[in-house]
């Protein structure tokens, strides 16, 4: 740091003087010199350093008329909104000729009520659930002692007792404020005033009670919630995607969910209109009137598989002599399922009913026995799954199949494995 | 540099009160609590009670029925009153700030006729 | 009220030995708990404060540990300084209440 050399005397008749004030002050700090010639740029030193951003003004007013005559040169020093930064030894320097004069020094410093490095933010927190608050102040002047204040009462006998920094809550079970006192010995600052909003816990083991094809039946146990009661839990649904998404962590699904609302208790609800045999991911939330809990994770369920829901479709049954041919297409009706196959039932005028499982085909060819003189023959056929059959379609007459008429592609087909089934009283 | 002083007789005669008062200068007295302790001669530390810096006060119930504290802070003062004092109260009392990092250097009050 | 019981309530020591001192607390007072040197004719001086906090300017060598109801101050290396009375304090409820001192003699 550059030295005041004392071979000359020293041209300051002026000297800083002193700030002592509290955060945000503005003051200025001010030299004056007498010099002989060409008036010095005055510098600025803090703690020895020259000043090189110094927010300093220059004023020069000469004594004679000669530009050799006296100057007087007083610079100015402003300070603005004053900081911990600002605090320190300052002098001023001017260089003259080879040398280098330093005034003597003045002090900035900074004093004042507490100031708040942090303070406690409003927050939500589930009934019951431990968090933390932070607080955090500084002077000068130190020490500064904090007291901590929920709804307006001290949680310690005197500032400096109880928690400082951090404040551990171990709990609460109705919405609270806090906030925080800091002293020192200028005197008190207290801190914005935080909200604490308590919630109702997670709800706990969301669990199926009963599944339906369309619908699934679940439960829940609530978490605690204060003093504040439960006024409804919602429900979400949303169809399983590939894999990705709900199973790979992913927080919401990509489609939009089915929501339902539960008045509690009971802490159960059905949900209707699903696909069956269809995987889906549920969760559930509970409300007070303080707010929403979290949601539980999502949980994978699925409904399971129905019986189709209509008969087959188009069914046609026409007769050729000692043969029978039968065809039909996939019900319309949702089939509630993977289809696993049809069975096929004919019967005749007084005569017992004739059940076969045709499979997944959608045709059969019937060989009759004898000369097919039964009367009245029709033919039912029912798709079922593996919850069962869906309804059989209305009853189908055996028509006998006229030459001249254009015979169905399908009546070609035979089958060369299956045994002819017969009549027995044929 | 925060100091605390305490002043006030040094004697006081049996059933009279005690008054005392701790000047403060350094440390402003509406921040923080401050409080009064006594010590009877070759005995332990006894609390009495403090002032908050809003000028509520707390004291020990077994001197509650006896004992006041007040302030004025246009003198950065509080005091002690004491009173129907017995020899049992004689004592050297001190001021300090209730986080304890300055106190008073003590004055002892004989209770005696 | 809340009783603080110290222990010893006086020991004879050595320049340089390490001494412990108790302070037990009738019922949990968390970690509000101070501790206290006074030497004769003197105001007690704080040592520690929060039952673990080492107050400003004091030495190194003192040191608190405890929570709920048992404290103990200790000195690693006792100094001819150090020979004095040691009070612990509870403030976690009024009345605030003192051990009734422990009296640190040279041997």
């Known amino acids: 740091a550059p030295r005041g050399t004392q071979a000359e005397e020293s041209p300051f008749v002026g000297n800083p003087g002193n700030i002592t004030g509290a955060r945000g002050l503005t003051g200025t700090l001010r030299c004056q010199l007498q010099v002989q010639g060409e008036p010095p740029e005055v510098h600025w030193l803090r703690d020895g350093q020259i000043l090189e951003l110094a927010d300093s003004t220059q004023t020069q007013v000469p004594l004679g008329e000669d530009e050799q005559d006296d100057w007087i040169v007083v610079s100015q020093l402003r300070i603005t909104s004053l900081q911990l930064s600002d605090t320190g030894q300052y002098q001023c320097l001017v260089f003259l000729g080879h040398q280098t004069f330093v005034s003597q020094p003045g002090y900035v410093g900074l004093e004042g009520l507490p100031y708040f490095l942090e303070e406690p933010e409003d927050r939500t927190v589930a009934a019951n659930t431990p968090f933390n608050l932070s607080c955090q102040a500084q002077g000068p002047p130190e020490p500064v002692d904090l007291l901590w204040l929920q709804d307006a009462v001290p949680l310690a006998t005197a500032p400096g007792h109880g928690p400082q920094r951090s404040l551990h809550v171990p709990g609460l079970n109705k919405t609270s404020s806090f906030s925080c006192e800091a002293h020192n010995a200028k005197g008190v600052t207290t801190s914005r005033t935080a909200t604490i909003t308590v919630l109702p816990q997670q709800p706990r083991n969301l669990h199926l009670v009963s599944r339906q094809p369309t619908e699934l039946e679940v439960a829940w146990t609530p978490g605690l919630s204060g003093i504040y009661p439960l006024t409804h839990c919602t429900l979400q649904a949303v169809l399983s995607d590939d894999g990705m998404g709900i199973q790979a962590g992913e927080p919401d699904p990509p489609e939009e969910p089915l929501t339902s609302q539960a008045s509690v208790p009971p802490h159960q609800l059905r949900l209707g209109s699903l696909h069956p045999h269809t995987p889906y991911h549920i969760r559930v939330a509970c409300t007070s009137s303080q707010g929403p809990s979290s949601w539980t994770h999502w949980l994978p369920v699925e409904t399971p598989e129905g019986v189709p829901l209509g008969p087959p479709e188009n069914i046609s049954a026409t007769r050729n002599g000692s043969q029978a041919f039968v065809h039909w297409q996939e019900p319309r009706a949702p089939l509630q399922g993977t289809l696993l196959g049809y069975r096929l039932a004919y019967q005749g005028q007084d005569t017992p009913e004739v059940l076969m499982d045709i499979g997944l085909r959608q045709e059969v060819t019937l060989e009759l026995q004898g000369d097919g003189s039964v009367s009245n023959l029709t033919v039912c056929v029912a798709a079922y799954t593996a919850a069962g059959d869906g309804p059989w379609s209305l009853p189908v007459p055996l028509e006998a199949w006229r030459p001249g008429e254009a015979q169905p592609v399908h009546q070609l087909v035979k089958e060369p494995s299956t045994p002819a089934f017969s009549w027995p009283w044929w | 540099q925060v100091q605390l002083q305490e002043s006030g007789p040094g004697l006081v005669k049996p059933s009279e009160t005690l008054s005392l008062t701790c000047t403060v200068s350094?440390?402003?007295?509406?921040?923080?609590?401050w409080g009064w302790i006594r010590q009877p001669p070759g005995k332990g530390l006894e609390w009495i009670g403090y002032i908050t810096y809003s000028g509520s006060t707390s004291y020990n119930p077994s001197l509650k029925s006896r004992v006041s504290i007040s302030r004025d802070t246009s003198k950065n003062q509080f005091s002690l009153k004491l009173s129907s004092v017995t020899a049992a109260d004689t004592a050297v009392y001190y001021c300090?700030?209730?986080?304890?990092?300055?106190w008073g250097q003590g004055t002892l009050v004989t209770v005696s006729s | 009220d809340i009783q603080m019981t110290q222990s010893p309530s006086s020991l004879s020591a050595s320049v340089g030995d390490r001494v412990t001192i108790t302070c037990r607390a009738s019922?949990?007072?968390?970690?509000?708990l101070r501790w206290f040197q006074q030497k004769p004719g003197k105001a007690p001086k704080l040592l520690i404060s929060?039952?673990?906090n080492l107050a400003a300017g004091v030495p190194s060598r003192f040191s608190g540990s405890g929570s709920g109801s048992d404290f103990t101050l200790t000195i690693s290396s006792l100094q001819p300084e150090d020979f004095a009375t040691y009070y612990c304090l509870q403030s976690k409820e009024s009345p605030w209440t003192f051990g009734q001192g422990t009296k640190v003699e040279i041997k």
């Open positions: 300090a700030i209730t986080t304890f990092y300055y």
């Open positions: 929060g039952a673990t």
């Open positions: 350094g440390y402003s007295i509406t921040s923080n609590y």
């Open positions: 019922q949990d007072i968390g970690n509000y």
